[in-house]
Interface confidence: low
């Protein structure tokens, strides 16, 4: 059910409180690895290691994306992979910066209709199902860079060209400036900066904090919408329970979002989506007579 839909592998790099930011190179334990007279030491992090077959996956996704999207056919996927790899290979996985990803950002530059952007927080699956049906709207993961990295984990090791498949830094327990977190922070910021007119955001009404200031949306995207371009942020609050007819647009966290947005000189609007299953069905078939009653 909707209660189980979380942001999964789009790692919520900022989800903890700020005291986690003091973590640096010293965290992680050293463990012996390999055989031979000179033991090789590797840092042991708290998070899962790089996704299996990471290089092949990124390359394959890039090829597939550029085949499906004619406007990106000019992209050289080998160069994309080299730039991706260059952002984190041989670098300490707790010392990654947005600058490390700039060559990749440059290669992945893509124009999406700025008035067709759908942001989401902790309800990724439904957001993606929606843009699969409503093909002229885009989530971050519908862009090349978002598509490449969606659901993947990666990190390297300082001073070696190896990819670490054993473990990678966890945002909370190890450090915030890790390769995955910095990547999503960078692309999320750029995506929000590109938005114009009316920007939509899908929020999970089943969560205790429907709007969470510590989510990617709450800490990066909200603050990077450009008031001179964005007229309105419209929140779609997705209900989880079939019989839940409360107006979740009145939730205190939504009021908090409205306050933040209003202070940035952007208008705020909110809609409840009571029946996400019916909502998707009605996006597919708006002519269906049952789609004129509540969704």
């Amino acid at each position: 059910g909707l209660n189980d839909i979380f942001e999964a592998q789009k790692i919520e790099w900022h989800e903890g409180s700020h005291h986690h930011h003091h973590h640096h190179h010293g965290s992680g334990s050293l463990v012996p690895r390999g055989s031979g007279s000179v033991p090789r030491w590797r840092q042991q992090w708290s998070g899962p290691g790089t996704t299996k077959r990471f290089p092949e996956t990124v390359l394959a996704r890039c090829v597939k994306y550029t085949e499906i999207h004619p406007e990106m056919r000019h992209v050289d996927c080998q160069s994309v992979w080299d730039a991706f790899k260059g952002a984190f290979i041989s670098k300490h996985p707790c010392n990654i910066t947005e600058e490390d990803y700039q060559p990749l950002m440059k290669l992945g530059t893509q124009t999406v209709p700025c008035n067709k952007i759908l942001l989401w927080s902790r309800i990724k699956d439904l957001a993606h199902q929606f843009t699969q049906v409503q093909r002229d709207m885009f989530t971050l993961e519908d862009t090349l860079l978002g598509y490449l990295a969606d659901d993947l984990t990666w990190c390297g090791e300082f001073n070696t060209s190896k990819i670490n498949y054993q473990s990678c830094p966890d945002w909370r327990k190890d450090c915030s400036n890790n390769p995955v977190s910095v990547f999503w922070k960078t692309v999320s910021r750029r995506f929000a900066e590109a938005a114009c007119d009316v920007v939509h955001v899908m929020l999970n009404g089943s969560r205790s904090k429907i709007f969470d200031k510590n989510s990617t949306f709450g800490s990066v995207e909200v603050h990077n919408l450009q008031p001179e371009k964005v007229q309105t942020l419209e929140a779609w609050v997705i209900h989880g329970g079939r019989e839940d007819s409360r107006d979740l647009c009145q939730d205190p966290t939504i009021k908090e979002l409205e306050s933040i947005i209003s202070k940035r000189n952007i208008q705020f609007s909110c809609k409840n989506i009571y029946r996400p299953d019916k909502f998707l069905q009605c996006v597919k078939n708006p002519e269906d007579s049952s789609c004129t009653s509540e969704i």
Partner: antibody, heavy 123, light 112 residues
Framework: QVQLVQSGAEVKKPGSSVKVSCKAS????????ISWVRQAPGQGLEWMGG????????NYAQKFQGRVTITADESTSTAYMELSSLRSEDTAVYYC????????????????WGQGTLVTVSS | DVVMTQSPLSLPVTPGEPASISCRSS???????????LEWYVQKPGQSPQLLIF???NRASGVPDRFSGSGSGTDFTLKINRVEAEDVGVYYC?????????FGGGTKVEIK
Amino acid sequence: QVQLVQSGAEVKKPGSSVKVSCKASGGTFSSYAISWVRQAPGQGLEWMGGIIPIFGTANYAQKFQGRVTITADESTSTAYMELSSLRSEDTAVYYCARDSSSWYFTYGYFQHWGQGTLVTVSS
Amino acid sequence: DVVMTQSPLSLPVTPGEPASISCRSSQSLLNSNGYNYLEWYVQKPGQSPQLLIFLGSNRASGVPDRFSGSGSGTDFTLKINRVEAEDVGVYYCMQALQSPLTFGGGTKVEIK
């Protein structure tokens, strides 16, 4: 404050078409349903159909199916209603109306109305 | 289509007195979420219609509290507890449960 401003009165010949516009200002356009409702002289209100711009596909009352086309241009926040094969019975004031709902993502809850456009069909 | 029947057709009222308009639908407007998808509109002379009541009994913003909506399923009532001169106009009920949306024939409220 949401405002809906409609195009001016039209006089048309039977068999021709008319296209009425409805420009929205002062609020979100794309995900709020815009409906078209008409009122013949001295008669009641009649819903013709509507569109949720973000979804693009219109929903029409069976009575007008095939004769009416409702579209929306998100770039100008304008909705259009085109009625073809006009006959004298189509003489009416045509209103656009927008939902103002945090309650349902749908037609109805017409909090905002245009000023109306009189279309006269006469030979 | 859902047929909406209003009565009376005309309602002469005295200012300060209550008034009541009835609306009946050919099928239930009660949705599975517990709400009745019935709305009331008034069209004052020379004006566009305006929303009074939505979801059967909820007053729209800016609507005076002398207006109230009640009923469920197929039978609904709009009450004005003390009519004022500015309340003259034609009152319509409308079902918003399914396509096509349909209006009642209207009730003309006029001052005696």
